[in-house]
Interface confidence: low
Amino acid sequence: QGNRWRRSKRASYVSNPICKGCLSCSKDNGCSRCQQKLFFFLRREGMRQYGECLHSCPSGYYGHRAPDMNRCARCRIENCDSCFSKDFCTKCKVGFYLHRGRCFDECPDGFAPLEETMECVEGCEVGHWSEWGTCSRNNRTCGFKWGLETRTRQIVKKPVKDTILCPTIAESRRCKMTMRHCPGGKRTPKAKEKRNKKKKRKLIERAQEQHSVFLATDRANQ
């Protein structure tokens, strides 16, 4: 590094590549003024600093336009790799998500991480939970010891990408029925249900038998 400086001091510093685009250049410090539209950037070599005039600023710096001269200024945003301005990041360090010009290790509420771009995008926005519904089972509010009560919430805004899942919009929990027995002395309709199911099954079996017989005779006639 030191040799480079010794060489450039012997040579005419104007021909030094560091002086490209300069309005003012010195052998010790390189550029100190840049041509219009170029950005002044202070580069380090060891503990020496020297100026360069660049068309665009290096990673970790942004182009700051000023009346006296445009310059490259350091991104001061935490965990930011490159930025557009003093307070707007465009690329975060590895492991951080970009959201509105800032870098986060976790996306804020209402936003979901998009792993392929490491950005926080608008997640699925849901409303508030409703009150818990009536405790019921098989659409009945009596006749059982335990039932289920449900609450729901609406999707207010769909996510920008289909790959982003919405949180659950309905949830149920076990609840104790207020009436173990239904009014009017009716027993639990379990036995009746069982009888009906048995009847139904027998009817289906009989119909299937008849259908098989019909197919067999039909084939014989052909």
Epitope: N29, R33, F40, M47, M69, R76, E78
Partner: antibody, heavy 119, light 110 residues
């Protein structure tokens, strides 16, 4: 908001040792060069030591008056920079400031910690 | 000859303008320099970096402050002086392996 908080100052006898600490917040500490600058009572500013980042292998530089006695180090995982001061002299009595270094100048300063070397 | 030379004190009136000077030794005459401001019992504050004919200000440095240079001289100009401008102003420069400060100029408002 960039914040630098120094600690570890105090009264020490000549030829004694002291370790100053500086905790940084509000910026990506591992990206920044760090320095210690001191100011003797009623005097001007004096640069003391400087440490580069990991990219530059944590290279260190010292002013002639402290070389061989002081040692600067950093712990990026804890956002800390340290100044180990050995074989202290009365002329080391000063307020020691921890500073961030933008492009080899000191753009942010801590509140300082007082070091008094006296028998 | 010191690397950076500053006059010990300067006085000026409230609302007026003032120009502080930092003179570089011949071997450093092309260097950039920095200006720092320090109020009594406070930490120094970076104001700006001055190059040949241009400057880069630090965050929070008022527009009333500007920097310029002429040969080996570097200037800090303050217009419309305010009470809070009363402070010591240091210039500083980086060399190959060290950083040097000037002795400071005390700005007093009349």
């Amino acid at each position: 908001e960039v914040q630098l908080v120094e600690s570890g100052g105090g009264l020490v006898k000549p030829e004694g040792s002291l370790k100053l600490s500086c905790v940084a917040s509000g910026f990506t500490f591992s990206d920044y060069f760090m320095s210690w600058v001191r100011q003797a009572p009623g005097q001007g500013l004096e640069w003391v030591a400087h440490i580069y980042t990991k990219t530059y292998n944590y290279a260190t530089y010292y002013s002639g008056s402290v070389k061989g006695r002081f040692s600067i180090s950093r712990d990026d995982s804890r956002n800390m920079v340290y100044l180990q001061m050995n074989n202290l002299r009365t002329e080391d009595t000063a307020t020691y400031y921890c500073t961030t270094d933008e492009d080899w100048y000191f753009d942010f300063w801590g509140q300082g910690t007082q070091v008094t070397v006296s028998s | 000859q010191p690397v950076l030379t500053q006059s010990p004190s300067v006085s000026a009136s409230l609302g007026a303008s003032v120009k502080l000077t930092c003179t570089l030794s011949s071997q450093h005459s092309t260097n950039y320099i920095e200006w720092y401001q320090q109020h009594p019992d406070k930490s120094p504050k970076f104001l700006m970096q001055v190059r040949d004919g241009s400057h880069s200000k630090g965050d929070g440095t008022p527009d009333r402050f500007s920097g310029s240079s002429s040969g080996a001289h570097r200037y800090l100009s303050i217009s419309n002086l305010q009470l809070e401008d009363e402070a010591i102003y240091y210039c500083g420069l980086s060399d190959v392996s060290l950083y040097l400060f000037g002795s400071g100029t005390q700005l007093t408002l009349l």
